[in-house]
């Protein structure tokens, strides 16, 4: 059984940096394993080496540790449009990203989907597409922004937010999304 994180932190703080307290003998501090390795056996006693083994293929540790097992490498999720930027090594997890002219949208802290950057047809680029943010478009007169695309005011129904933007006007309409269609 792995002790709760707080207990492990408490135990580690008894030893100098780079060492951890022996689980069976709290008077002994063992050297932590380097990144890319994991703890196979605790050190037998003070001044003796910890038995660390290299992570097997498909697993990694990214920092010094006393883990009993390496962590499994992440897989890029093809169904979310993700591509592999760099493959997993013993000391670094897989890095996933998006293709050129796409951005990441995070549905949650650890799940993102790749979407094409908006081209701002019938408008102009107000802010360029970035790694984690779509292009921000400014629509030409006679168009309103819906789902980050500039749509003709002829498609504006009276019930929608666009009615404010599609009144006769001379100025460009900037980035107020039509909230009535999503």
């Amino acid at each position: 059984l792995v002790p709760p994180l707080r207990d492990r932190e408490k135990r580690d703080s008894v030893c100098p940096q780079g060492k951890y307290i022996h689980p069976q003998n709290n008077s002994v501090c063992c050297t932590k394993c380097h990144k890319g390795t994991y703890l196979y056996n605790d050190c037998p006693g003070p001044g003796q080496d910890t038995d660390c083994r290299e992570c097997e293929s498909g697993s990694f540790t990214a920092s010094e540790n006393h883990l009993r097992h390496c962590l499994s490498c992440s897989k890029c999720r093809k169904e979310m449009g993700q591509v592999e930027i760099s493959s997993c090594t013993v000391d670094r997890d897989t890095v996933c990203g998006c293709r050129k002219n796409q951005y990441r949208y995070y549905w949650s802290e650890n799940l993102f989907q790749c979407f094409n950057c908006s081209l701002c047809l019938n408008g102009t680029v107000h802010l360029s597409c970035q790694e984690k943010q779509n292009t921000v478009c400014t629509c030409h007169a006679g168009f309103f922004l819906r789902e980050n695309e500039c749509v003709s005011c002829s498609n504006c129904k009276k019930t929608l937010e666009c009615t404010k933007l599609c009144l006769p006007q001379t100025e460009n309409v900037k980035g107020t999304e039509d909230s009535g269609t999503t």
């Epitope: 897989k75 999720r77 093809k78 169904e79 979310m80 949208y105 549905w107 989907q113 979407f115 094409n116 779509n134 789902e147 980050n148 999503t182």
Partner: nanobody
Framework: EVQLLESGGGLVQPGGSLRLSCAAS????????MVWVRQAPGKGLEWVSH????????YYADSVEGRFTISRDNSKNTLYLQMNSLRAEDTAVYYC????????????WGQGTLVTVSS
């Protein structure tokens, strides 16, 4: 016309189980990645799980990993969510949806089914 109809929600005690179903029509179900999302009272949408077209390598949110199982039957155009070891914090309206393609919004999703976990 795309239709997604969820069922199987209800009142269950903590530790109990429920199986949600989502009957799909109006599109080629077997060609789409399908998603379960939920909305707890007074909160935003939370991604629960998704499953690709062939039902391999499902994704689960950390909050449901090991307790929920997503599956699909392409011959029946139906998506499922088996929910075990239910907790009070799983109380929410559960929606099934088609994975978006054009942008981060759901074009197609159901009306939802309410799951209440309470003793």
């Amino acid at each position: 016309e795309v239709q997604l109809l969820e069922s199987g929600g209800g009142l269950v005690q903590p530790g109990g189980s429920l199986r949600l179903s989502c009957a799909a029509s109006g599109f080629t179900f077997a060609h789409e990645t399908m998603v379960w999302v939920r909305q707890a009272p007074g909160k935003g949408l939370e991604w629960v799980s998704h499953i690709d077209r062939v039902g391999q390598d499902p994704y689960y949110a950390d909050s449901v990993e090991g307790r929920f199982t997503i599956s699909r039957d392409n011959s029946k155009n139906t998506l499922y969510l088996q929910m075990n070891s239910l907790r009070a914090e799983d109380t929410a309206v559960y929606y099934c949806a088609v994975l978006p393609k054009r942008g981060p919004w759901f074009d197609y999703w159901g009306q939802g089914t309410l799951v209440t976990v309470s003793s």
